[in-house]
């Protein structure tokens, strides 16, 4: 029979014949022959391979270095890499999450639109008219100005994006 030019799924072509790939968690030791099956070996501890493969070396698990603000989100196995995330109050600097930076705070006049997560930074927005923020915070939203009317008071000092309005008593009309 003619040698194959393509192989089935989970196989690879070598020396004009189709050999079985090694399953996730195992590496290739020797290709199959006419008389023998592909020889695979399990990855060592703290190593992995996450696909059907013909790799001769397993990949090392990622190290979630606490000195870089990292912690383990998902422990590595023979078939999966370790997944790192950041300690509370920090977020990853890249998709690979190789290091962390402190969450950004929103300055006075700005409020938090979206609170940071382990993988994304704080998103700030300017406080619109009628709202203010007088603190630098990674959690505080813009607060609405106090409604003097509902307290039977009048505005004595207008609010800004950084300060609340100041309410005061209504001037009594003299008889």
């Amino acid at each position: 029979p003619e040698p194959p030019t393509a192989c089935r799924e989970k196989q690879y072509l070598i020396n004009s014949q189709c050999c079985s790939l090694c399953q996730p968690g195992q590496k290739l030791v020797s290709d199959c022959t006419e008389f023998t099956e592909t020889e695979c070996l399990p990855c060592g501890e703290s190593e992995f391979l996450d696909t059907w493969n013909r790799e001769t070396h397993c990949h090392q698990h990622k190290y979630c270095d606490p000195n870089l603000g990292l912690r383990v989100q998902q422990k590595g196995t023979s078939e999966t890499d370790t997944i790192c995330t950041c300690e509370e109050g920090w977020h990853c600097t890249s998709e690979a999450c190789e290091s962390c930076v402190l969450h950004r705070s929103c300055s006075p006049g700005f409020g938090v639109k979206q609170i940071a997560t382990g993988v994304s930074d704080t998103i700030c927005e300017p406080c619109p008219v009628g709202f203010f923020s007088n603190v630098s915070s990674a959690f505080e939203k813009c607060h609405p100005w106090t409604s003097c009317e509902t307290k039977d008071l009048v505005v004595q000092q207008a609010g800004t994006n950084k300060t609340d309005v100041v309410c005061g008593p209504q001037d009594r009309l003299r008889a």
Partner: antibody, heavy 119, light 113 residues
């Protein structure tokens, strides 16, 4: 036969130091990750620290971070736990346990060594 | 940290009776890459170190009798002893093997009635 034998336990004063050892035999020590787990008298199990087979990866419980150091010597088939600034709450039986690269679970445990921190 | 909550704390069962121990984790123990739940059960007999009983939620360690079985997924897990034997008197611990820090349940003490 897999064997893990801990030693180095004893009575220590608060603020003092102690070094525990775990001698491994019956398997290729350098192929396995290792853990220290402790158990306070009459209480449950608490994980303390982990070191990977090749020394590259080390993790600690927050309760011991900065005070305890896990290390290993693959040539001597030995695991160590250096414990500094000991506190009364560190009083426990300390077990070493093996982690393989297949189950990723602690599949063998030593008999444990008791560390008592008291003045 | 993942909190592991076991129930009951203890139970006394007659020989030959069924034992059910529950374990709840504060977050999922499902590894997204290989779809295995990294929940481990250990058995600790009086005066002895713990011994691995079940890993990946339901896979019995070699040499463990088939009266022991594990089930569950995500955050809810169960250890069952189908017919209690005298040698099963022990404390049973579930353990998060999904992430660091590794965490254990408080333990369930199984005694004979």
């Amino acid at each position: 036969e897999v064997q893990l034998v801990e030693s180095g336990g004893g009575l220590v004063k608060p603020g003092g130091s102690r070094r525990l050892s775990c001698a491994a035999s019956g398997f290729t020590f350098s192929d396995y990750g290792m853990h220290w787990v402790r158990q306070a008298p009459g209480k449950g199990l608490e994980w303390v620290a982990y070191i990977s087979s090749g020394n590259r990866i080390i993790y600690y419980a927050d309760t011991v971070k900065g005070r305890f150091t896990i290390s290993r010597d693959n040539a001597k088939n030995s695991l160590y736990l250096q414990m500094n600034s000991l506190r009364a709450e560190d009083t426990a039986v300390y077990y070493c346990a093996r982690q393989d690269g297949y189950r990723y679970a602690m599949d063998y445990w030593g008999q444990g060594t008791l560390v008592t921190v008291s003045s | 940290d993942i909190v592991m909550t076991q129930s009951p704390d203890s139970l006394a069962v007659s020989l030959g009776e069924k034992v059910t121990i529950n374990c709840k984790s504060s977050q999922s123990l499902l590894n997204s890459g290989n779809q295995k739940n990294y929940l481990t059960w250990h058995q600790q007999k009086p005066g002895q170190p713990p011994k691995l009983l079940i890993y990946w939620t339901s896979t019995r360690e070699s040499g463990v009798p088939d009266r022991f079985s594990g089930s569950g997924s995500g955050t809810d897990f169960t250890l069952t002893i189908s017919s209690l034997q005298a040698e099963d008197v022990a404390v049973y611990y579930c353990q998060n093997d999904y992430t660091y820090p590794l965490t254990f349940g408080g333990g369930t003490k199984v005694e004979i009635k």
